[in-house]
C-alpha cells in the first residue's frame, strides 16, 4: 500500500496523459484524483504505465469503489483488468456484452485465467441463461468454453443457442456434457430435413441414445468413423451388425482400424461371429 503524502506543487494531474508515466508511485497516489481516473479510464491503455504504476491506479479505483466498480469503468479497464483478482471481479455487475468482449480481448490468445472464468460466470449468472450472442462471443474467444461447463450449467443453455455451436466447440466435451447438449440440439434442429439435420446434429451425437442411432441407420447418413468413435458405449452396444453397417455405409471398413479401441472393441465382443463375418473385415468377436 502506498503511503499517503501531499502532492508536490504543480504536479496535480488535470487529466490522464503521458506525463504521468514519469510520476513515482507515491506521486501517482498523491496527485491523481480517483474520480478523474474513473472518468478517463479509456486513456489508461494508451499510456505505457509500468506494472507498479498500474497497481497504484487499481488501488485508487478500489478506494473509490469499495463495493465494486461500475460498468462504465469496467468497460474501459483494458490491461488493468489483468491486475484484478477473482475476488475483485465477484463484486462486479457486468450486463453488457460489449463490456465482456472488451475484457476478453485483453486476455486474447491466453488460456482462460481464473479472472476470466469468474468474469464469465458473473456475466452468465447475471443474464440467467447462456443466450446465443453470449455463446457466440465466448466460443469465439475460447473454443473449449462450452466443454468447461458442468452438466448443471449446460442445462441453462436454451435450444436456440445451439445454433451458435461449432463442431470444434464440442471437441473436449465428455459424455455427461453431451448427454445434456444432445436433446437440446435435437430440439433446435428438429425442423431440418434428413441430410441437413445429420450435418448439424453430427457433433452432438456423443449424447445420442440407441433408438436415435437406430433411426439414423435407416437414413443412409454414412457416418464417419471419427463420429462413430465418439458415440456412447451404452448406445452402441445394442446395435446389430446390420444397423452399424447401414449407419456407417462405405465407412464400415474403418472398423478394422479401430477394433482395439472403445466403443468398437466392446461392440465387436458382443456380436455373433457369423454376423461379424458378413462384413468381410476379419473382425474377431
Amino acid at each position: 500500500e502506498v503511503e499517503k503524502t501531499a502532492c508536490p506543487s504543480g504536479k496535480k494531474a488535470r487529466e490522464i496523459d503521458e506525463s504521468l508515466i514519469f510520476y513515482k508511485k507515491w506521486e501517482l497516489e498523491a496527485c491523481v484524483d480517483a474520480a478523474l481516473l474513473a472518468t478517463q479510464m479509456d486513456r489508461v491503455n494508451a499510456i505505457p504505465f509500468t506494472y507498479e504504476q498500474l497497481d497504484v491506479l487499481k488501488h485508487k479505483l478500489d478506494e473509490l469503489y469499495p463495493q465494486g466498480y461500475p460498468e462504465s469503468v469496467i468497460q474501459h479497464l483494458g490491461y488493468l483488468f489483468l491486475k484484478m483478482s477473482p475476488e475483485d471481479i465477484r463484486k462486479w455487475n457486468v450486463t453488457s456484452l460489449e463490456t465482456l468482449k472488451a475484457l476478453l480481448e485483453v486476455n486474447k490468445g491466453h488460456e482462460m485465467s481464473p479472472q476470466v472464468a469468474t468474469l464469465i460466470d458473473r456475466f452468465v449468472k447475471g443474464r440467467g441463461q447462456l443466450d446465443k450472442d453470449t455463446l457466440d462471443t465466448l466460443t469465439a474467444f475460447y473454443p473449449g468454453y462450452l466443454c468447461s461447463l458442468s452438466p448443471e450449467e449446460l442445462s441453462s443453455v436454451p435450444p436456440s443457442s445451439i445454433w451458435a455451436v461449432r463442431p470444434q466447440d464440442l471437441d473436449t466435451c465428455d459424455p455427461r456434457q453431451l448427454d445434456v447438449l444432445y436433446p437440446k440440439a435435437r430440439l433446435a434442429f428438429q425442423n431440418m430435413n434428413g441430410s441437413e439435420y445429420f450435418v448439424k446434429i453430427q457433433s452432438f451425437l456423443g449424447g445420442a441414445p440407441t433408438e436415435d442411432l437406430k433411426a439414423l441407420s435407416q437414413q443412409n447418413v454414412s457416418m464417419d468413423l471419427a463420429t462413430f468413435m465418439k458415440l456412447r458405449t451404452d448406445a452402441v452396444l445394442p446395435l446389430t451388425v446390420a444397423e452399424v453397417q447401414k449407419l456407417l455405409g462405405p465407412h464400415v471398413e474403418g472398423l478394422k482400424a479401430e477394433e482395439r479401441h472403445r466403443p468398437v472393441r466392446d461392440w465387436i465382443l458382443r456380436q455373433r461371429q457369423d454376423d461379424l463375418d458378413t462384413l468381410g473385415l476379419g473382425l474377431q468377436g
Partner: antibody, heavy 119, light 107 residues
Amino acid sequence: QVQLQESGPGLVKPSETLSLTCTVSGGSVSSRDDLWSWIRQPPGKGLEWIGYIYYSGSTNYNPSLKSRVTISVDTSKNQFSLKLSSVTAADTAVYYCAREDALTGFDIWGQGTMVTVSS
Amino acid sequence: DIQMTQSPSSLSASVGDRVTITCRASQSSRYYVNWYQQKPGKAPKLLIYAASSLQSGVPSRFSGSGSGTDFTLTISSLQPEDFATYYCQQSYDASYTFGGGTKVEIK
C-alpha cells in the same frame, strides 16, 4: 451383490506355471455386460493389468505378458482362471481378479492373493 | 501401448486441503480414463469412470475432468480417510495401462 474370490497356491517355483482361479458369487460370469480381468501388483509397486476374458471365451492380454498368459472361463462353475508360465521372481505379486463393466471400470475386485515365486 | 504418466508421485497435504493429481496419456485416450483409490493391504476402489463420472457411493468431494491426453483427479477438501495411493487407468486401447500412482500423505 457380486463378489470375487481368488484362490490358488501362494508359493510357486521358478520356471513353473502359476495357476489361480477367481470364483464369482452373487452374479454370473456369463453376463453379457461384463469383462473379467486379472491384475497384479508387485510388493511396493503399482498395478499391472494382465488380461481379460469375456464369457464367450474371447480374451485380450497385456502384450508384455502375452506369450506366457492364458485366461480361461468355466461358466458351469462360475469361475475364470489365470495361468502364467515360466515364472521368475519378477512375477512375485498380489494377484487380483476384477470385474469390468464396459461403461465404468474395474468396479468390483477380489481381496487379492499373494503369490511368491521362490525355490 | 498408451503410457499413463501420473504426477506427482507423492504429495503431503493437510485435512481440508484441495488436492489435484494429474495423469497424462502418451496418446489420446478420449474420455476412457478411470481413477482408483488404494489403501495399504486392500484392493483398489473405483472412484471415477469415463474421466468425470462419479462411481456410485463415492463422496462428492472427489471429481475428475479431462479428455484426450490430460486428466485430473481433484479432492476438494481432503478428509482423514482420503490418505491413500491413487491410480489412473486408461481403457480406450485394448492394452489397458495404469499410471504409476500418487501417494497422498499427511503433512
